[in-house]
């Protein structure tokens, strides 16, 4: 509502340059280009960014100068379409350039690739990193933005600027230390982990927006904001949700300058109106812009008002329930979601949205009956199984995580998901299981009342990625079924899947389980991925293998690796012991 309503500007590009400042302007343009054209090199993009920046400066000097009145989509699209060899490098994406705005931008968006065939982003060793950082910090950070943005084409742009700033601060601090490596590694690993989570969360928001529209995203925002700011009134929450929806719509739509500018405005508004929003904002509001906006996005929940009446009073027992519902359905359901969410910071947003959906369906049915109160009178009791299901999921999985540790927990999930969808490619299953398995480390150590929202909302974001990858090459009916429903039903749908009985087991191929001495020198993470790849292949061969059988084989495999990697002649060990391992595996699974 109005936070973003500004007077019309003659030149949009000059306006955004002035609002954002040169550094952020350049960073955002680089991110935008890298997310659209994911195969171009840093140098190619850096050249375009400089040209756009120079042009923006001419418009700042004279808003009436040639082309300064053009829309950002027109200016950026023209730049991208002028790249030489576009068709050779990008194939049918070049067809976008035959279209006019806004269709051209829509076309670019449709060609964003969630799984680009780019090598993993390898971190150079500490000395080399520090040398290139010291030589040219701007270019170094530019490379970081480019490499992350092209691999994550929906990364929340203003948040990526925040992570780049964190990266910069870590390098500034650690490159001055004697032992650069031990200073850098844990800190940069921490930033990387947080950034990867941020990426899947934002991709989920964009999926919500793309598949179900602004209304769906706004419902998500109302629930989330009501949990965090239980003392804010409904009008305040509605206002914040409307503004947050606009910011996310802009970023998901590739309007990164507008998105970052509006996000800064929203942060400013929140800090100027703490009294009516939350008592917990001051610490965030004392920080500089990027840190402030990041801090506000994950601020702790305010203390719940002590005197909130039971939800039943106004939404079940009140005689006017059907009248209020009929009068303005969206408004009444919005107030229900607000009231329920502010009372339940211990629930996931997905669960809150499922409850609101259940409430809506109940009113839809009951308000058409002869005696509505008798019909909807039990609605809160009917919420119980919906609440119990994710609570049980959290308990079961956190117990398993505590028993097995992260790696073992990932393996348990890998087996489970390979049985549910054995047609899915092994690399996708391994990536999904590793990500799903991290939920243990991330959430199971939290206090009881924070576990459920952490677990379920994280799992939903990871499963959204599974759906996006599966959409490109649909192979499993199970996955298609779960992915084509509503976003909030996905996680329960995947959890309910059992062994796919239609699957014809893969024939046993010895080469799939043949390993060489080069595995010994791999970093621990890569070793784990190799072993998990073998585990998924075993399950595809024997989908109904018992946990005991799989454990026997995997223990044998681990022992084989340990023995051969310690052997004086590793190659001989692998070539002689390998076939024996394969034979034992076949016998164990027979």
């Amino acid at each position: 509502r109005g936070v973003f309503r500004r007077e019309a500007h003659k030149s949009e590009i000059a306006h955004r340059y002035n609002d954002l400042g040169e550094q952020h302007f350049k960073g955002l343009v680089l991110i935008a280009f890298s997310q659209y054209l994911q195969k171009c090199s840093y140098d190619e993009h850096a050249k375009l960014v400089q040209e756009v920046t120079d042009f923006a400066k001419t418009c700042v000097a004279d808003e009436s100068a040639a082309n300064c009145d053009k829309s950002l989509h027109t200016l950026f699209g023209d730049k991208l379409c002028a790249i030489p060899n576009l068709r050779e490098n990008y194939g049918e994406l070049a067809d976008c350039c035959t279209k006019q705005e806004p269709e051209r931008n829509e076309c670019f968006l449709q060609h964003k690739d969630d799984n680009p065939s780019l090598p993993p982003f390898e971190r150079p060793e500490a000395e080399a990193m520090c040398t290139s950082f010291k030589e040219n910090p701007t270019t170094f950070m530019g490379h970081y933005l480019h490499e992350v943005a092209r691999r994550h084409p929906y990364f929340y742009a203003p948040e990526l600027l925040y992570y780049a700033e964190q990266y910069n601060e870590i390098l500034t601090q650690c490159c001055a230390e004697a032992d650069k490596e031990s200073c850098l590694t844990p800190k940069l690993d921490g930033v990387k982990e947080k950034a990867l989570v941020s990426s899947v969360r934002q991709r989920m928001k964009c999926s919500s927006m793309q598949k179900f529209g602004e209304r769906a995203f706004k419902a998500w925002a109302v629930a989330r904001l009501s949990q965090t700011f239980p003392n804010a009134d409904f009008a305040e929450i509605t206002k914040l949700a409307t503004d947050l929806t606009k910011v996310n719509k802009e970023c998901c739509h590739g309007d990164l300058l507008e998105c970052a500018d509006d996000r800064a405005e929203l942060a400013k508004y929140m800090c100027e109106n703490q009294a009516t929003i939350s008592s917990k904002l001051q610490t965030c509001c004392d920080k500089p812009l990027l840190k402030k906006a990041h801090c506000l996005s994950e601020v702790e929940h305010d203390t719940m008002p002590a005197d909130l009446p039971a939800i039943a009073a106004d939404f079940v027992e009140d005689q006017e329930v059907c009248k209020n519902y009929a009068e303005a359905k969206d408004v009444f359901l919005g107030t229900f979601l607000y009231e329920y969410s502010r009372r339940h910071p211990d629930y996931s947003v997905s669960l809150l949205l499922r409850l609101a959906k259940k409430y809506e369906a109940t009113l839809e049915k009951c308000c058409a009956e002869a005696n509505p109160p008798a019909c909807y009178g039990t609605v809160l009791a009917e919420f119980q199984p919906l609440v119990e299901e994710p609570k049980n999921l959290v308990k079961t999985n956190c117990d398993l995580y505590e028993k097995l540790g992260e790696y073992g927990f990932q393996n348990a999930i890998l087996v489970r998901y390979t049985q549910k969808a054995p047609q899915v490619s092994t690399p996708t299953l391994v990536e999904a299981a590793r990500n799903l398995g991290r939920v243990g480390t991330k959430c199971c150590t939290l206090p009881e009342d924070q576990r459920l929202p952490c677990v379920e909302d994280y799992l939903s974001a990871i499963l959204n990625r599974v759906c996006l990858l599966h959409e490109k090459t649909p192979v499993s009916e199970h996955v298609t079924k779960c992915c084509s429903g509503s976003l909030v039903e996905r996680r329960p749908c995947f959890s309910a899947l059992t062994v796919d009985e239609t699957y014809v087991p893969k024939e046993f191929k010895a080469e799939t389980f043949t390993f060489h001495s080069d595995i010994c020198t791999l970093p621990e993470k890569e070793k784990q991925i190799k072993k998990q790849t073998a585990l998924a292949e075993l399950v595809k061969h024997k989908p109904k293998a018992t946990a005991e059988q799989l454990k026997t084989v995997m223990d044998d495999f681990a022992q084989f690796l340990d023995t051969c990697c310690k052997a004086a002649d590793k190659d001989t060990c692998f070539s002689t012991e390998g076939p024996n391992l394969v034979t034992r595996c076949k016998d164990a699974l027979a």
Partner: nanobody, 120 residues
Framework: EVQLEESGGGLVQPGGSLRLSCAAS????????MGWYRQAPGKERDMVAT???????YYADSVKGRFTISRDNAKNTVYLQMNSLKPEDTAIYYC??????????????WGQGTQVTVSS
């Protein structure tokens, strides 16, 4: 009897002004955020402006700078001053009361609506 009664609607030319009033009876006015929503034919009912019990105001983007909401707690009345009216402001305007405190009284209360038509 608990009710909201709107008045002030009518036909006005583009660029003209109107002032809507909504009088509340039978409820503790100070416990309610008051607002104006509008509904055009075949559309959802959308928020136009809201005023909280503390007097904080919120506006839809489409009316910001043209409409002003205010309340007079002594008269149990909320107003919507509408200036620079446009044809797209044509709709039925509804007054709404939304209970903000834990005292009894209806949680949500709507008026019957008043028609605003902007046309030359």
């Amino acid at each position: 009897e608990v009710q909201l009664e709107e008045s002030g609607g009518g036909l006005v030319q583009p660029g003209g002004s109107l002032r809507l009033s909504c009088a509340a009876s039978g409820l503790t006015f100070n416990d309610y955020a008051m607002g104006w929503y509008r509904q055009a034919p075949g559309k959802e009912r959308d928020m136009v402006a809201t005023i909280s019990i503390g007097g904080r105001t919120y506006y839809a983007d489409s009316v910001k700078g043209r409409f002003t909401i205010s309340r007079d707690n002594a008269k149990n009345t909320v107003y919507l001053q509408m200036n620079s009216l446009k044809p797209e402001d044509t709709a039925i305007y509804y007054c709404v009361a939304h209970r903000q405190t834990v005292v009894r009284g209806p949680y949500l209360l709507w008026g019957q609506g008043t028609q605003v038509t902007v046309s030359s």
